[in-house]
């Protein structure tokens, strides 16, 4: 009796089960009662990453430098090329089809996580006792200066954007 379902890594065609082509190979001809499935390796610029019955291999992704992209990992016959962004840029999506500049954290905010080729800068508000007076993609919130350790007193309180101002102690005390 002809099969109605096939084993793993097989497919049903013309009432018989044929072997799928292994990753890195494309289908040339289906199996018959006399021959196995005929498969051919993908060319150098192509890939197939699953057991398949595709008659064409997929083209490797092109990392377009005009879009700020560069090759992170070269593709093989079984894997696609992985693109990443050039220094100072990060991907706009998970598939990394284009890049945008990293954002800077504004004064009052510090860098919680520095950007990578695939993720943007993560900023956080400077908590009490910390400040940032610059717009930066790298600098964290810095602690206010400790006037006491310098035998000085606070003359002007700090904010999330400014450091404290220290001054000499009042001698009339």
């Amino acid at each position: 009796e002809p099969p109605t379902a096939c084993r793993e890594k097989q497919y049903l065609i013309n009432s018989q089960c044929c072997s799928l082509c292994q990753p890195g190979q494309k289908l040339v001809s289906d199996c018959t009662e006399f021959t196995e499935t005929e498969c051919l390796p993908c060319s150098e610029s192509e890939f197939l990453d699953t057991w398949n019955r595709e008659t064409r291999c997929h083209q490797h992704k092109y990392c377009d430098p005009n879009l700020g992209l560069q090759v992170q990992q070269k593709g093989t016959s079984e894997t696609d090329t992985i693109c990443t962004c050039e220094e100072g840029l990060h991907c706009t999506s998970e598939s990394c089809e284009s890049c945008v500049p990293h954002r800077s954290c504004l004064p009052g905010f510090g860098v919680k996580q520095i950007a990578t080729g695939v993720s943007d800068t993560i900023c956080e508000p400077c908590p009490v006792g910390f400040f940032s007076n610059v717009s930066s993609a790298f600098e964290k919130c810095r602690p206010w200066t400790s006037c006491e350790t310098k035998d000085l007193v606070v003359q002007q309180a700090g904010t999330n954007k400014t450091d404290v101002v220290c001054g000499p102690q009042d001698r009339q005390r």
């Epitope: 001809s29 009662e33 021959t35 196995e36 005929e38």
Partner: antibody, heavy 117, light 107 residues
Framework: EVKLVESGGGLVKPGASLKLSCAAS????????ISWVRQTSDKRLEWVAS????????YYPDNVKGRFTISRENAKNTLYLQMSSLKSEDTALYYC??????????WGQGTSVTVSS | DIVLTQSPVTLSVTPGDSVSLSCRAS??????LHWYQQKSHESPRLLIK???QSISGIPSRFSGSGSGTDFTLSINSVETEDFGIYFC?????????FGAGTKLELK
């Protein structure tokens, strides 16, 4: 018991035609593809033709394509090979063989074809 | 067409010897290869399928190995009934092709 019995061989002149038969028994004939394979005097084996279980697909090597025709009558459990425009190089012992899991798992005893003037 | 080259052409052995017969394909055929034995005045019979799978009724002294382009048929302790010609056959693509055979004869 699986049995394949070839017949129809003989001595013919170049350019002549000949029809070989293969009678099958001991298995469900209509479930199996069948091939013809020939063996020359130097003992080399050469695939000649194949036909699918239903008879809808046939396969030939280039050197016999257009001259040989494989066919089958499932109701009669019989396989045929119609050979025309025979050449001296077609001289051989012709076997029919059953295709089981893509292997020629059972062979007949062969029938001899001689093409000579 | 895929060409199968068998070696040696002839192998002269004494019963009890263990032997290896080679079959080399002109291009990769994965494990899509069968082995047949043909004794004198008999039809070929299937010995090993898919390069290494045993066949019911065939003595366990026969074994096959290999994948890609290089294949081996091994006979562990040859018996007198093993003399004859051994053929490999590929079923990776059309046309189906056979090797020219290795003749196993008595030394």
């Amino acid at each position: 018991e699986v049995k394949l019995v070839e017949s129809g061989g003989g001595l013919v002149k170049p350019g002549a035609s000949l029809k070989l038969s293969c009678a099958a028994s001991g298995f469900t004939f209509s479930n199996y593809g069948i091939s013809w394979v020939r063996q020359t005097s130097d003992k080399r084996l050469e695939w000649v033709a194949s036909i699918s279980s239903g008879g809808d697909n046939t396969y030939y090597p280039d050197n016999v394509k257009g001259r040989f025709t494989i066919s089958r009558e499932n109701a009669k459990n019989t396989l045929y090979l119609q050979m025309s425009s025979l050449k001296s190089e077609d001289t051989a012992l012709y076997y029919c063989a059953r295709a089981g899991e893509k292997a020629m798992d059972y062979w007949g005893q062969g029938t001899s074809v001689t093409v000579s003037s | 067409d895929i060409v199968l080259t068998q070696s040696p052409v002839t192998l002269s052995v004494t019963p009890g010897d263990s032997v290896s017969l080679s079959c080399r394909a002109s291009q990769t055929i994965n494990n899509n290869l069968h082995w047949y034995q043909q004794k004198s005045h008999e039809s070929p019979r299937l010995l090993i399928k898919y390069a290494s799978q045993s066949i019911s009724g065939i003595p366990s002294r026969f074994s096959g190995s290999g994948s890609g382009t290089d294949f081996t048929l091994s006979i562990n302790s040859v018996e007198t009934e093993d003399f004859g010609i051994y053929f490999c056959q590929q079923f990776s693509s059309w046309p189906l092709t056979f090797g020219a055979g290795t003749k196993l004869e008595l030394k």
